[in-house]
Protein backbone atom coordinates (compact mmCIF):
# COMPACT_ATOMS: atom_id res chain seq x y z
CA UNK A 1 0.00 0.00 0.00
CA UNK A 2 1.18 3.53 -0.78
CA UNK A 3 2.74 5.45 2.10
CA UNK A 4 0.68 8.30 3.51
CA UNK A 5 1.94 11.73 2.44
CA UNK A 6 1.26 15.00 4.25
CA UNK A 7 1.72 17.73 1.66
CA UNK A 8 2.41 21.36 2.53
CA UNK A 9 2.95 22.85 -0.94
CA UNK A 10 4.32 26.26 0.11
CA UNK A 11 7.73 26.41 1.77
CA UNK A 12 7.04 29.97 2.86
CA UNK A 13 4.21 32.50 3.11
CA UNK A 14 4.54 36.23 3.84
CA UNK A 15 1.70 38.39 5.14
CA UNK A 16 1.30 41.89 6.55
CA UNK A 17 0.53 42.28 10.25
CA UNK A 18 -3.21 42.42 10.75
CA UNK A 19 -3.99 40.36 7.66
CA UNK A 20 -4.94 36.68 7.41
CA UNK A 21 -2.59 33.86 6.42
CA UNK A 22 -3.64 30.69 4.65
CA UNK A 23 -1.50 27.62 5.32
CA UNK A 24 -2.21 24.76 2.92
CA UNK A 25 -2.10 21.08 3.75
CA UNK A 26 -3.49 18.00 2.03
CA UNK A 27 -3.11 14.30 2.76
CA UNK A 28 -2.70 11.62 0.11
CA UNK A 29 -4.91 9.04 1.79
CA UNK A 30 -7.87 8.74 4.15
CA UNK A 31 -6.18 5.76 5.79
CA UNK A 32 -5.29 5.34 8.58
CA UNK A 33 -8.16 7.03 10.41
CA UNK A 34 -7.09 9.82 12.73
CA UNK A 35 -6.98 13.57 13.20
CA UNK A 36 -4.80 16.31 11.76
CA UNK A 37 -3.29 18.89 14.10
CA UNK A 38 -1.35 22.04 13.28
CA UNK A 39 1.72 23.13 15.26
CA UNK A 40 4.05 26.11 15.19
CA UNK A 41 7.61 24.89 15.55
CA UNK A 42 8.94 21.36 15.96
CA UNK A 43 10.16 19.23 18.83
CA UNK A 44 9.05 19.37 22.47
CA UNK A 45 8.61 23.15 22.43
CA UNK A 46 6.13 23.17 19.57
CA UNK A 47 2.94 25.14 20.01
CA UNK A 48 -0.49 23.67 19.28
CA UNK A 49 -2.24 25.97 16.79
CA UNK A 50 -5.29 23.97 15.77
CA UNK A 51 -6.94 20.75 16.81
CA UNK A 52 -10.42 20.09 15.45
CA UNK A 53 -11.16 17.52 18.17
CA UNK A 54 -10.91 19.75 21.22
CA UNK A 55 -10.02 23.22 22.36
CA UNK A 56 -10.95 26.67 21.23
CA UNK A 57 -8.89 28.26 18.48
CA UNK A 58 -10.67 31.51 17.75
CA UNK A 59 -8.24 32.93 15.19
CA UNK A 60 -7.99 29.71 13.19
CA UNK A 61 -10.56 28.39 10.75
CA UNK A 62 -10.47 25.34 8.50
CA UNK A 63 -10.53 26.30 4.81
CA UNK A 64 -12.51 23.16 3.91
CA UNK A 65 -15.09 21.41 6.07
CA UNK A 66 -12.90 18.96 8.01
CA UNK A 67 -15.94 16.94 9.12
CA UNK A 68 -17.00 16.23 5.54
CA UNK A 69 -16.71 12.62 4.42
CA UNK A 70 -13.60 11.94 2.33
CA UNK A 71 -12.11 15.36 3.09
CA UNK A 72 -8.37 15.39 2.39
CA UNK A 73 -7.79 19.15 2.64
CA UNK A 74 -6.70 20.33 6.09
CA UNK A 75 -5.63 23.85 5.17
CA UNK A 76 -6.20 26.56 7.77
CA UNK A 77 -6.58 30.32 7.82
CA UNK A 78 -5.16 32.35 10.72
CA UNK A 79 -6.70 35.79 11.14
CA UNK A 80 -5.30 39.04 12.51
CA UNK A 81 -1.64 38.05 12.24
CA UNK A 82 0.90 39.61 14.62
CA UNK A 83 4.73 39.47 14.69
CA UNK A 84 4.52 36.74 17.36
CA UNK A 85 2.85 34.47 14.79
CA UNK A 86 6.03 34.28 12.70
CA UNK A 87 7.56 30.83 12.52
CA UNK A 88 7.32 27.47 10.79
CA UNK A 89 3.97 25.71 10.82
CA UNK A 90 3.58 21.95 10.55
CA UNK A 91 0.53 19.96 9.53
CA UNK A 92 0.70 16.66 11.42
CA UNK A 93 -1.30 13.47 10.88
CA UNK A 94 -2.15 11.27 13.86
CA UNK A 95 -3.48 7.71 14.04
CA UNK A 96 -6.65 7.46 16.12
CA UNK A 97 -6.04 5.85 19.50
CA UNK A 98 -5.87 6.44 23.22
CA UNK A 99 -3.85 8.57 23.02
CA UNK A 100 -3.60 9.41 19.32
CA UNK A 101 -0.20 8.49 17.83
CA UNK A 102 1.75 10.89 15.64
CA UNK A 103 2.29 9.37 12.20
CA UNK A 104 3.65 11.92 9.79
CA UNK A 105 4.40 15.62 9.56
CA UNK A 106 4.37 17.88 6.55
CA UNK A 107 7.61 19.59 5.56
CA UNK A 108 6.51 22.85 7.15
CA UNK A 109 5.53 26.29 5.90
CA UNK A 110 7.47 29.29 7.16
CA UNK A 111 5.25 32.27 7.95
CA UNK A 112 6.93 35.66 7.90
CA UNK A 113 5.15 38.80 9.06
CA UNK A 114 5.70 42.15 7.39
CA UNK A 115 5.02 45.47 9.08
CA UNK A 116 1.65 46.82 8.06
CA UNK A 117 2.10 49.53 5.42
CA UNK A 118 1.28 52.92 6.92
Amino acid sequence: EEELQVIQPEKSVSVAAGDSATLNCTVSSLIPVGPIQWFRGAGPGRELIYNLKEGHFPRVTAVSDPTKRNNMDFSIRISNITPADAGTYYCVKFRKGSPDVELKSGAGTELSVRAKPS
Epitope: P44, G45, L48, T82, A84
Partner: antibody
Framework: DVQLVESGGGVVRPGESLRLSCAAS????????MNWVRQAPGEGLEWVSR????????DYADSVKGRFTISRDNSKNTLYLQMNSLRAEDTAVYYC????????????WGLGALVTVSS | ETVLTQSPATLSVSPGERATLSCRAS??????LAWHQQKPGQAPRLLIY???NRATGIPDRFSGSGSGTDFTLTISSPQTEDSAVYYC??????????FGGGTKVEIK
Protein backbone atom coordinates in the same frame (compact mmCIF):
# COMPACT_ATOMS: atom_id res chain seq x y z
CA ASP B 1 -17.42 27.22 34.15
CA VAL B 2 -13.66 27.81 33.99
CA GLN B 3 -12.03 27.57 37.40
CA LEU B 4 -8.39 28.11 38.38
CA VAL B 5 -7.44 27.46 42.00
CA GLU B 6 -3.92 28.15 43.27
CA SER B 7 -2.38 26.50 46.31
CA GLY B 8 1.00 26.13 47.96
CA GLY B 9 1.60 29.69 49.07
CA GLY B 10 3.10 30.50 52.44
CA VAL B 11 5.89 32.16 54.39
CA VAL B 12 9.51 31.20 53.66
CA ARG B 13 12.96 32.58 54.42
CA PRO B 14 15.22 34.09 51.76
CA GLY B 15 17.03 31.37 49.81
CA GLU B 16 14.34 28.75 50.45
CA SER B 17 12.02 27.09 47.93
CA LEU B 18 8.29 26.78 47.40
CA ARG B 19 6.10 25.10 44.81
CA LEU B 20 2.78 26.60 43.73
CA SER B 21 0.05 24.56 42.07
CA CYS B 22 -2.92 25.68 40.01
CA ALA B 23 -5.79 23.19 39.58
CA ALA B 24 -7.78 23.86 36.40
CA SER B 25 -11.28 22.76 35.50
CA UNK B 26 -14.08 23.65 33.11
CA UNK B 27 -12.00 23.65 29.91
CA UNK B 28 -9.69 21.44 27.85
CA UNK B 29 -6.58 22.21 29.89
CA UNK B 30 -4.15 20.43 27.57
CA UNK B 31 -5.13 22.65 24.64
CA UNK B 32 -4.12 25.96 26.20
CA UNK B 33 -0.99 27.85 27.12
CA MET B 34 -0.91 28.90 30.79
CA ASN B 35 0.85 31.68 32.68
CA TRP B 36 1.88 32.85 36.13
CA VAL B 37 1.47 36.55 36.93
CA ARG B 38 2.39 38.12 40.25
CA GLN B 39 1.44 41.23 42.17
CA ALA B 40 3.64 42.61 44.94
CA PRO B 41 1.78 44.31 47.81
CA GLY B 42 0.32 47.62 46.60
CA GLU B 43 1.90 47.21 43.15
CA GLY B 44 0.76 46.38 39.63
CA LEU B 45 0.71 43.14 37.67
CA GLU B 46 3.97 41.51 36.57
CA TRP B 47 4.06 38.58 34.16
CA VAL B 48 6.31 35.80 35.50
CA SER B 49 6.22 32.81 33.19
CA ARG B 50 4.38 31.02 30.37
CA UNK B 51 4.17 27.38 29.32
CA UNK B 52 2.75 26.14 26.05
CA UNK B 53 -0.06 23.61 25.76
CA UNK B 54 2.17 20.56 25.46
CA UNK B 55 4.54 21.67 28.23
CA UNK B 56 7.71 21.68 26.15
CA UNK B 57 7.94 25.41 25.55
CA UNK B 58 8.54 27.88 28.39
CA ASP B 59 9.26 31.59 28.78
CA TYR B 60 10.32 33.57 31.85
CA ALA B 61 10.60 37.16 32.98
CA ASP B 62 14.23 38.21 33.43
CA SER B 63 13.60 38.76 37.15
CA VAL B 64 12.96 35.03 37.77
CA LYS B 65 15.00 33.34 35.03
CA GLY B 66 17.22 30.59 36.41
CA ARG B 67 15.36 30.50 39.74
CA PHE B 68 11.76 29.64 38.81
CA THR B 69 10.55 26.67 36.74
CA ILE B 70 7.09 26.41 35.23
CA SER B 71 5.65 22.99 34.41
CA ARG B 72 2.33 21.27 33.89
CA ASP B 73 0.75 17.84 34.20
CA ASN B 74 -1.95 17.60 31.56
CA SER B 75 -3.19 14.29 32.95
CA LYS B 76 -3.94 16.05 36.26
CA ASN B 77 -5.08 19.39 34.77
CA THR B 78 -2.52 21.11 36.97
CA LEU B 79 -0.02 23.92 36.45
CA TYR B 80 3.04 24.34 38.70
CA LEU B 81 5.59 26.98 39.57
CA GLN B 82 8.73 25.78 41.33
CA MET B 83 10.37 28.76 43.03
CA ASN B 84 13.96 28.37 44.23
CA SER B 85 16.42 30.83 45.82
CA LEU B 86 13.53 33.04 46.87
CA ARG B 87 14.20 36.71 47.61
CA ALA B 88 12.30 39.34 49.58
CA GLU B 89 11.32 40.97 46.28
CA ASP B 90 9.48 37.79 45.25
CA THR B 91 6.89 38.51 47.93
CA ALA B 92 3.59 38.77 46.04
CA VAL B 93 0.26 37.23 45.27
CA TYR B 94 0.81 34.75 42.44
CA TYR B 95 -2.01 34.23 39.96
CA CYS B 96 -2.31 31.54 37.33
CA UNK B 97 -3.91 32.76 34.13
CA UNK B 98 -5.26 30.93 31.09
CA UNK B 99 -4.59 32.21 27.59
CA UNK B 100 -7.49 32.65 25.19
CA UNK B 101 -5.43 31.05 22.47
CA UNK B 102 -1.73 30.37 22.03
CA UNK B 103 -0.84 33.93 21.01
CA UNK B 104 -3.30 36.01 22.94
CA UNK B 105 -4.55 37.72 26.09
CA UNK B 106 -5.36 36.15 29.46
CA UNK B 107 -9.06 35.39 29.63
CA UNK B 108 -9.36 33.72 33.05
CA TRP B 109 -7.46 34.26 36.28
CA GLY B 110 -7.18 32.26 39.48
CA LEU B 111 -7.87 33.73 42.91
CA GLY B 112 -4.17 33.91 43.74
CA ALA B 113 -1.75 32.45 46.30
CA LEU B 114 0.22 34.68 48.66
CA VAL B 115 3.96 34.05 48.89
CA THR B 116 5.84 35.92 51.63
CA VAL B 117 9.64 35.83 51.71
CA SER B 118 10.91 37.20 54.99
CA SER B 119 13.72 36.55 57.44
CA GLU C 1 10.32 45.68 24.76
CA THR C 2 6.98 47.42 24.53
CA VAL C 3 6.22 49.72 27.47
CA LEU C 4 2.59 50.56 28.31
CA THR C 5 1.89 53.85 30.06
CA GLN C 6 -1.49 54.38 31.68
CA SER C 7 -2.98 57.71 32.63
CA PRO C 8 -4.19 59.14 34.84
CA ALA C 9 -2.82 57.19 37.80
CA THR C 10 -6.03 57.94 39.70
CA LEU C 11 -9.41 59.03 38.39
CA SER C 12 -12.21 60.17 40.65
CA VAL C 13 -15.66 60.42 39.09
CA SER C 14 -19.24 60.75 40.29
CA PRO C 15 -21.72 57.97 39.57
CA GLY C 16 -23.08 58.42 36.05
CA GLU C 17 -20.20 60.70 34.99
CA ARG C 18 -18.18 59.34 32.06
CA ALA C 19 -14.76 57.95 32.93
CA THR C 20 -12.01 57.87 30.29
CA LEU C 21 -8.81 55.87 30.87
CA SER C 22 -5.80 55.99 28.56
CA CYS C 23 -3.15 53.42 27.68
CA ARG C 24 -0.23 54.38 25.43
CA ALA C 25 2.23 51.87 23.94
CA SER C 26 5.85 52.75 23.18
CA UNK C 27 5.48 51.06 19.76
CA UNK C 28 2.56 49.81 17.74
CA UNK C 29 0.66 46.86 19.14
CA UNK C 30 -1.93 46.82 16.36
CA UNK C 31 -5.25 46.00 18.00
CA UNK C 32 -3.67 43.49 20.38
CA LEU C 33 -4.57 45.18 23.62
CA ALA C 34 -6.74 43.95 26.49
CA TRP C 35 -8.14 45.67 29.58
CA HIS C 36 -8.45 43.93 32.96
CA GLN C 37 -10.35 45.10 36.03
CA GLN C 38 -9.15 44.35 39.55
CA LYS C 39 -11.33 45.14 42.52
CA PRO C 40 -9.74 45.39 46.00
CA GLY C 41 -8.79 41.97 47.34
CA GLN C 42 -9.87 40.19 44.17
CA ALA C 43 -8.20 38.61 41.15
CA PRO C 44 -8.10 40.51 37.85
CA ARG C 45 -10.98 40.00 35.41
CA LEU C 46 -10.88 40.40 31.64
CA LEU C 47 -13.03 43.30 30.40
CA ILE C 48 -11.97 44.07 26.82
CA TYR C 49 -9.83 42.25 24.27
CA UNK C 50 -8.55 43.10 20.78
CA UNK C 51 -8.89 46.78 21.81
CA UNK C 52 -12.68 46.97 21.49
CA ASN C 53 -14.36 43.59 22.10
CA ARG C 54 -16.20 43.13 25.37
CA ALA C 55 -15.53 39.85 27.18
CA THR C 56 -18.42 37.56 28.08
CA GLY C 57 -20.71 39.01 30.72
CA ILE C 58 -19.21 42.51 30.73
CA PRO C 59 -21.82 45.29 30.88
CA ASP C 60 -22.11 47.51 27.82
CA ARG C 61 -21.19 50.62 29.82
CA PHE C 62 -17.59 49.44 29.30
CA SER C 63 -16.14 50.12 25.86
CA GLY C 64 -12.67 50.12 24.37
CA SER C 65 -11.23 51.93 21.38
CA GLY C 66 -7.95 52.70 19.67
CA SER C 67 -5.27 50.97 17.65
CA GLY C 68 -1.55 51.28 17.08
CA THR C 69 -0.20 53.08 20.13
CA ASP C 70 -3.15 54.92 21.70
CA PHE C 71 -6.02 53.17 23.44
CA THR C 72 -8.96 54.23 25.56
CA LEU C 73 -11.23 52.46 28.02
CA THR C 74 -14.48 54.31 28.60
CA ILE C 75 -16.98 53.67 31.38
CA SER C 76 -20.01 55.53 30.05
CA SER C 77 -21.99 55.71 33.29
CA PRO C 78 -19.90 54.38 36.19
CA GLN C 79 -21.57 52.52 39.04
CA THR C 80 -20.19 52.27 42.56
CA GLU C 81 -19.19 48.65 41.86
CA ASP C 82 -16.82 49.88 39.12
CA SER C 83 -14.38 51.18 41.75
CA ALA C 84 -11.25 49.22 40.87
CA VAL C 85 -7.80 49.36 39.31
CA TYR C 86 -7.80 48.93 35.53
CA TYR C 87 -4.79 47.46 33.70
CA CYS C 88 -4.04 47.31 30.00
CA UNK C 89 -2.11 44.34 28.57
CA UNK C 90 -0.44 44.02 25.16
CA UNK C 91 0.02 40.72 23.35
CA UNK C 92 1.42 41.86 20.01
CA UNK C 93 5.06 41.32 20.95
CA UNK C 94 5.99 38.67 23.54
CA UNK C 95 7.68 37.44 25.62
CA UNK C 96 7.47 39.24 27.89
CA UNK C 97 3.78 39.97 28.23
CA UNK C 98 3.46 43.53 29.46
CA PHE C 99 0.89 45.30 31.60
CA GLY C 100 0.44 49.00 32.13
CA GLY C 101 0.95 50.43 35.60
CA GLY C 102 -2.79 50.69 36.21
CA THR C 103 -5.38 53.41 36.70
CA LYS C 104 -7.28 53.51 39.98
CA VAL C 105 -10.90 54.54 39.47
CA GLU C 106 -12.73 55.91 42.48
CA ILE C 107 -16.47 56.49 42.39
CA LYS C 108 -17.32 59.43 44.66
Amino acid sequence: DVQLVESGGGVVRPGESLRLSCAASGFSFRSYAMNWVRQAPGEGLEWVSRINSGGGGTDYADSVKGRFTISRDNSKNTLYLQMNSLRAEDTAVYYCAKQYDWNSFFDYWGLGALVTVSS
Amino acid sequence: ETVLTQSPATLSVSPGERATLSCRASQTVGSKLAWHQQKPGQAPRLLIYDASNRATGIPDRFSGSGSGTDFTLTISSPQTEDSAVYYCQQYYYWPPYRFGGGTKVEIK
